[in-house]
Amino acid sequence: EVEKTACPSGKKAREIDESLIFYKKWELEACVDAALLATQMDRVNAIPFTYEQLDVLKHKLDELYPQGYPESVIQHLGYLFLKMSPEDIRKWNVTSLETLKALLEVNKGHEMSPQVATLIDRFVKGRGQLDKDTLDTLTAFYPGYLCSLSPEELSSVPPSSIWAVRPQDLDTCDPRQLDVLYPKARLAFQNMNGSEYFVKIQSFLGGAPTEDLKALSQQNVSMDLATFMKLRTDAVLPLTVAEVQKLLGPHVEGLKAEERHRPVRDWILRQRQDDLDTLGLGLQGGIPNGYLVLDLSMQEALS
């Protein structure tokens, strides 16, 4: 806490400018009017204040706005944003995407800090849903943003926003998240033709059910192996050898190279060996010819 001391004669700040960098902390406190600071916040960024001096400026704003800063001030915080705590940010009401962008720019190149996470949370909650422009902005700064949301939070994403999602934005999503996003993507891209549809939906297929994979297998999509291995195991297991061959096209050859990994391994164990032999890969571990396959889960359901 800076002590209240009178401003020395002739030192009262008329505007926020470079001369203030020579002020001691107590002089800043005494000689800079908080209302002047608030109206000239855009100048602070251009002046090389020390961290200690920035602390004083923050303190002045806190005194002026105990209930939280107005958006006109927030938009011009610049590096002063890094001094804010999540508790400070929870008092704000940020509604402008431009304000959000300005603050994200300050933190660019760094991991998402608790301050940024709080800011985004406040912004999205204020908007009521994660619209396309917001999603565009957030994934541009933080490609992993979408996958940091819970399935419940993702459920508020409208299908129209899915157009903003790039494949790399989904890299760290788990199956539960893709389960929520896939139906939205399916809806968003439903009017596209076969090959264009597959290009767009491919990144979301980790949430696709078996029947959708069967439908895709009829469309000559040539799914690559990396995409195939991200599919839900429970969705892959019921697929026949013929369906997997059609789904992967030339990439089916790669099953041999990945036969020890899920879901390939589990799928192989479910297939008849003579069907596997038709793939021309020397895959082993299928159900021997002549054996009868009992679906025990069906039997349990009946008893």
Epitope: S222, L225, A226, K230, E253, G254, H261, R262, L279, L281
Partner: antibody, heavy 117, light 113 residues
Framework: EVQLVQSGAEVKKPGASVKVSCKAS????????MHWVRQAPGQGLEWMGN????????YYNERFMSRVTMTVDKSTSTAYMELSSLRSEDTAVYYC??????????WGQGTLVTVSS | DIVMTQSPDSLAVSLGERATINCKSS????????????LAWYQQKPGQSPKLLIY???TRESGVPDRFSGSGSGTDFTLTISSLQAEDVAVYYC?????????FGGGTKVEIK
């Protein structure tokens, strides 16, 4: 020992077709896919397509889609690649290569196809 | 199509010295589930067919001398010959087998300085 022995050099006129053979030995022919790759004189390598020798299903690089046909004869463990409507830029060494999973683990000695009027 | 860019085009290295060849792909070659990178390296000596050296970016094919090593992940890969021998004079190619059409780099010619 795995061996892929290709047919001899060919000289063809523009517009003609050529069929290159690749006889495999030393492994179970139907357990490994066969690829075809070509190399123009002094140039790099270009993948043309692959074939499943068990089912005969083949997949082609779109650049050659309308002109290439890949087939196999399981009884003789031989793969074939036929390229039609030949033009001078098809002059190249054509290789068959046996897959090792996805990568090309064994290569034939190559067949030089010269297209000249 | 995935574009493979090799550098340098040619390389002159003294016997016993290290040779390093780079290969960059226009998109990731990493299968994030298996953590395998779908990249292979081949050696083609003058007048011969190509020969597989490395697959999955870093797995040495059996019979390949251990002076050859591959590294890298995602989009950036390297083939290193730790101590160049006279018999290593050749053109080296990288190839992606992530998505068809499988594509090769333009090749790097390695010579003795």
């Amino acid at each position: 020992e795995v061996q892929l022995v290709q047919s001899g050099a060919e000289v063809k006129k523009p517009g003609a077709s050529v069929k290159v053979s690749c006889k495999a030995s030393g492994y179970t022919f139907t357990n490994y896919w066969m690829h075809w790759v070509r190399q123009a004189p002094g140039q790099g390598l270009e993948w043309m397509g692959n074939i499943n020798p068990s089912s005969g299903d083949s997949y082609y690089n779109e650049r050659f889609m309308s002109r290439v046909t890949m087939t196999v004869d399981k009884s003789t463990s031989t793969a074939y690649m036929e390229l039609s409507s030949l033009r001078s830029e098809d002059t190249a060494v054509y290789y068959c290569a046996r897959s090792g999973g996805l990568w090309l683990a064994f290569w034939g000695q190559g067949t030089l196809v010269t297209v000249s009027s | 199509d995935i574009v493979m860019t090799q550098s340098p085009d040619s390389l002159a290295v003294s016997l016993g010295e290290r040779a390093t060849i780079n290969c960059k792909s226009s998109q990731t070659l990493l299968n994030s589930v298996s953590q395998n990178n779908y990249l292979a390296w081949y050696q083609q000596k003058p007048g011969q067919s190509p020969k597989l050296l490395i697959y999955f970016a870093s797995t040495r094919e059996s019979g390949v001398p251990d002076r050859f090593s591959g590294s890298g992940s995602g989009t950036d890969f390297t083939l290193t010959i730790s101590s160049l021998q006279a018999e290593d004079v050749a053109v080296y190619y990288c190839q992606q087998h992530y998505r068809t059409p499988y594509t090769f780099g333009g090749g790097t010619k390695v010579e003795i300085k």
